[in-house]
């Protein structure tokens, strides 16, 4: 539950920020999402995190920045390698970034229904079988 | 505990420059972006203006913008506000606030320092 | 004429809810903190990021935020609650307040 709220929250943090056309948005960093398909989900969001905690450095934060380098930090290792050479707009790398928690929040989404419904069919099972 | 202390409000002419300053204490002040809000007498609260934690980036309201400037003194855990061409309207108490990471808000406010601008 | 509509004033009786409204085009799409102020003392972050509560504020208040409107809560307003009330969120050209709400509580 808690987890899908995180990435609600993460959502709309990058719906804010992608709909900003600030020079911010035009700054270079690594994209890191082109890991290998094997990669946890830990990995990636440490990845993406560590990538916000460097714009620290080209004062570009804001708020959501800030919010949104909290909320994936919450959910990811504490280290990971960083040894992409390619390298993305911050814009595009937000972007990229939405589609992944979208997914995952699609995903989660589902579950937790299929999930409740498991109960509540073992709950009513359970209470018909002993009455 | 964290605590902000303003200072340096006064009587001003219309026209005039005063220097306002915010000592910080309790937090690792280096680490937070600060900003001032003011308040008119009677009024709301107006956001003027945030500085980036190195101080690197400023921004400000269209109401302040060219007259205000914002700067920080990481050394002093100091945070200070520039006025010139001081207006009557200029006239409130001046905050001193600091932009949270855990919370995304204004988390801690001073208690002010009154600005009066009149001839 | 300020981006965030609040109404002036609310008058409740003492254990009644008070419902503050916070306008904007979309505000839903956008984070909203609520601040209290009473008189001659400086805001206090009431409600963060449209519905979490700081420490030390009580349960009593709650928020939440979709469409255009923001609304703060208080479940059993107390005499204590008599206050401002103002909504803040961040915009494309700074930080908003909204003009504030002040709630007198009669008992």
């Known amino acids: 539950h808690n987890f899908n709220i995180t990435i609600k929250e993460i959502i709309k943090m990058l719906n804010i920020l992608t709909a900003r056309n600030d020079s911010c948005m035009e700054l270079t960093v690594k994209d890191v999402f082109t890991a290998p398909k094997n990669t946890s989900d830990k990995e990636i969001f440490c990845r993406a995190a560590t990538v916000l905690r460097q714009i620290y450095t080209h004062n570009c934060s804001n708020r959501y920045l800030r919010g949104l380098y909290r909320n994936l930090s919450s959910m990811a290792n504490k280290t990971c390698s960083m040894n992409e050479i390619k390298k993305s707009t911050l814009k595009d790398f937000l972007e990229r970034l939405k589609v992944i928690m979208q997914k995952k929040y699609y995903r989660h989404g589902l579950n937790d229904i299929f999930e409740a419904q498991k109960i509540e069919w073992h709950e009513h099972h359970h209470h018909h079988h002993h009455h | 505990e964290v605590q902000l202390v303003e200072s340096g409000g006064d009587l001003v002419k219309p026209g005039g420059s005063l220097r306002l300053s915010c000592v910080a204490s309790?937090?690792?002040?280096?680490?937070?972006?600060m900003d001032w809000v003011r308040q008119a007498p009677g009024k709301g609260l107006e956001w003027l203006s945030e500085i980036s934690t190195n101080g690197d980036r400023t921004h400000y309201a269209d109401a302040v913008k060219g007259r205000f400037a914002i700067s920080r003194d990481n050394a002093k855990n100091t945070v200070y506000l520039q006025m010139n061409s001081l207006r009557a309207e200029d006239t409130a108490i001046y905050y001193c606030?600091?932009?949270?990471?855990?919370?995304?808000?204004?988390?801690?406010w001073g208690q002010g320092t009154l600005v009066t601008v009149s001839s | 004429q300020s981006v965030l509509n609040q109404l002036p004033s609310l008058s409740m009786n003492m254990g009644e809810t008070a419902t503050f409204t916070c306008e904007g085009d979309?505000?839903?799409?956008?984070?909203v903190n609520w601040y209290q102020q009473k008189p001659g003392q400086a805001p206090v972050l009431t409600i963060y990021?449209?519905?979490k509560r700081p420490s030390g504020i009580p349960e009593r208040f709650s928020g939440s935020n979709s469409g255009n409107t923001a609304t703060l809560t208080i479940s059993g307003a107390r005499a204590e609650d008599e206050a401002d009330y103002y909504c803040e969120s961040e915009v494309s050209t700074g930080i908003v307040f909204g003009g504030g709400t002040h709630l007198t509580v009669l008992g």
């Open positions: 990021e449209d519905n």
């Open positions: 979309n505000i839903g799409h956008k984070y």
């Open positions: 606030v600091r932009d949270g990471y855990e919370y995304l808000a204004f988390d801690y």
């Open positions: 309790g937090f690792t002040f280096s680490s937070y972006d």
